[in-house]
Interface confidence: low
């Protein structure tokens, strides 16, 4: 009959967690599950419960998590991995817009994330978007060019900096930058 379908794993309120702040990981499978297993990859930590509450985020808790469930003697496929990121580990970068934060529709703008540290990775978030701009050509660079700006690009942006050596330990977020498309 094949393996059971994979559950979903989410972090509430967000998978970006400031140090010392709480977060809840929730594994969701079908009704009537016999047993859940929630584990932190690359470690020996796991629990046989669907909900993991972290009352105060620590550096050591950042990383990749996944979960699965058991019905009878059958185990499900594992959930998609969840990347739990600790933020505020390093000082915030600065975010600026070139040539400026007000741009005409159809124009070009580049969002530039700058840090005093020698970080090699940067993430750019737009408020309301569920995930960062993570395209490979943007992910590894401090500049995020937006070609042919539209009204949809209007909004509040923040960036983070971090190192590829510790990809789940991020800086504090930059001060917000308001991009206005006229």
């Amino acid at each position: 009959s094949g393996p059971l379908p994979k559950p979903s794993l989410q972090a509430l309120p967000s998978s970006l967690v400031p140090l010392e702040k709480p977060v809840t990981l929730r594994c969701q499978g079908p009704p009537g599950v016999d047993l859940y297993r929630l584990e932190k990859l690359s470690s020996s930590r796991y629990q046989d419960q669907a909900v993991l509450f972290i009352p105060a985020m620590k550096r050591s808790l950042a990383g990749r998590y996944r979960c699965s469930y058991q019905n009878g003697s059958l185990w499900s496929l594992p959930s998609d991995q969840l990347e739990l990121v600790a933020t505020g580990v390093f000082a915030k970068p600065s975010l600026s817009a070139q040539p400026g934060p007000a741009v005409s529709s159809g124009g070009d703008v580049t969002l530039q994330c700058q840090t005093r540290y020698g970080f090699d990775q940067f993430a750019l978030y737009k408020e309301g978007d569920p995930a960062p701009y993570k395209n490979p050509e943007r992910w590894y660079r401090a500049s995020f060019p937006i070609i042919t700006v539209t009204a949809a690009h209007s909004g509040t942006y923040r960036c983070y900096s971090f190192s590829s050596r510790d990809p789940y330990l991020w800086s504090a977020p930059s001060d917000p930058l308001e991009l206005v498309v006229t």
Epitope: R45, Q47, Q49, F53, I54, P55, A56, K58
Partner: nanobody, 120 residues
């Protein structure tokens, strides 16, 4: 890394009271375990991060009370009506899972232990 430091152990007579303290370098779900000579480590009590939930071993229910002061990052074990069979090294432990578990495997961090001896 979480640092846990127990204090308050000592030698008392049966029927006396003791209060153990555990200072933690962070706020976690916490537990107390004990280990008597030649025996396995056993669960005593646990308390949730907020202090709203507790769990006790049957052998200490009604005699021991676990509590916490999050402002001081300290957990307490008030032990009343002590018996000779309560003699053990008492260990404070911290869990990243807020489930007041009685399972040793649920606890990630451990203190060095404090000796409690109850004479008859």
């Amino acid at each position: 890394q979480v640092q846990l430091q127990e204090s308050g152990g000592g030698l008392v007579q049966a029927g006396d009271s003791l209060r153990l303290s555990c200072a933690a370098s962070g706020t976690y779900s916490m537990g107390w375990f004990r280990q008597a000579p030649g025996k396995e480590r056993e669960f005593v009590a646990a308390i949730s991060w907020s202090g709203g939930r507790t769990n006790y071993a049957d052998s200490v229910k009604g005699r021991f009370t676990i509590s916490r002061d999050n402002a001081k990052n300290t957990v307490y074990l008030q032990m009343n009506s002590l018996k000779p069979e309560d003699t053990a090294v008492y260990y404070c432990s911290a869990a990243i899972y807020d489930n007041v578990s009685s399972r040793i495997g649920s606890y990630t961090y451990w203190g060095q232990g404090t000796q409690v001896t109850v004479s008859s």
